[in-house]
Interface confidence: low
Amino acid sequence: FKVATPYSLYVCPEGQNVTLTCRLLGPVDKGHDVTFYKTWYRSSRGEVQTCSERRPIRNLTFQDLHLHHGGHQAANTSHDLAQRHGLESASDHHGNFSITMRNLTLLDSGLYCCLVVEIRHHHSEHRVHGAMELQVQTGKDAPSNCVVYPSSSQDSENITA
């Protein structure tokens, strides 16, 4: 399986909400011994490998934000902890999963990584990640709504996140 990031760059004004999205592609084993963890964390663009460094998002670790289920099942994070930090991660039946960040501040700018870990009991984990940049802007040059830039082309698309 692979992870696709529909948008590689999100440019948002301070105070806005944004939903960062990843999509799980390819055949997904729904066997009883297969577990999927989907999660999010902050990182930096390392020399060797993007997303190799794991940093918390608003003090929540990748474990606080993880979704745990089999196959393409829907799931949500522990609401209380995440929502206290203005965060919510979610997953649907079609392989889409996302993290929503509310009331953005300049400190939220940076590289975000989504991670899918396939665990087969008695076997090693297989992990695939996707990366995207979030730029939070303030002042007169900031957009009125989030502007997202697709990963596959340079065209931008205005959305209200």
């Epitope: 963890y37 794991r54 090693s124």
Partner: antibody
């Protein structure tokens, strides 16, 4: 920086028990699976056991299954190996090693310096 | 259980020479879940290569890994004096994890 410090080794008689500890520092212990790996004098490396980050799953080498128990206390950043019914062939340096895996298991990216266990009458 | 066989058992070379170490698995190691470690006498092993071909943090570029399936190779392009040690391959494809018996790289 990441540090793993093993303790609890020593000389023990066959059939007796011993508990090894591994104190971890310099990283978020509760985010990583952990392993014990051993090396008999002059021999190669042998994987012993793994425990997942939250203790939910444990797996053992056949040679120690039913005799050794791996456990962890995330509040104390400590990994344990309870060794019962010890045999002469358990004599080895025991290393604790951090797994690079996010949840379950992957390769070992950091190792302790080891503690020697000698089983002898 | 996946059995890993390393060859040669001992390799005698001089500094500046190229070293090629082999690791063969008894069954296919999917996703190239194979690592290489270096161990010097009295020391703990050190991770060199993971996922068959990725250098670990801080490992010099003279170390490289290759291979897939059942045949894997560790290459040291130009030996430095500090490279003389014992090298182990390890699979993390399935439990029980297994190591090769090691290749001792000694100074000729």
């Amino acid at each position: 920086q990441v540090q793993l410090v093993e303790s609890g080794g020593g000389v023990v008689q066959p059939g007796r028990s011993l508990r090894l500890s591994c104190a971890a520092s310099g990283f978020t212990f509760s985010s990583y699976a952990m392993h014990w790996v051993r090396q008999a004098p002059g021999k190669g490396l042998e994987w012993v056991a793994i425990i997942w980050y939250d203790g939910s799953n444990k797996y053992y080498a056949d040679s120690v299954k039913g005799r050794f128990t791996i456990s962890r206390d995330n509040s104390k950043n400590t990994l344990y190996l309870q060794m019962n019914s010890l045999r002469a062939e358990d004599t080895a340096v025991y290393y604790c090693a951090r797994d690079s895996g996010f949840y379950s298991s992957y390769y070992f990216d950091y190792w302790g310096q080891g503690t020697l266990v000698t089983v002898s009458s | 259980e996946i059995v890993l066989t390393q060859s040669p058992a001992t390799l005698s070379l001089s500094p500046g020479e190229r070293a090629t170490l082999s690791c063969r698995a008894s069954q296919s190691v999917s996703s190239s879940y194979l690592a290489w470690y270096q161990q010097k006498p009295g020391q703990a092993p050190r991770l060199l290569i993971y996922d068959a071909s990725n250098r670990a943090t801080g490992i010099p570029a003279r170390f490289s890994g290759s291979g897939s399936g059942t045949d894997f190779t560790l290459t040291i392009s130009s030996l430095e004096p500090e490279d003389f040690a014992t090298y182990y391959c390890q699979q993390y494809n399935s439990y029980p994890y297994t190591f090769g018996q090691g290749t001792k790289l000694e100074i000729k």
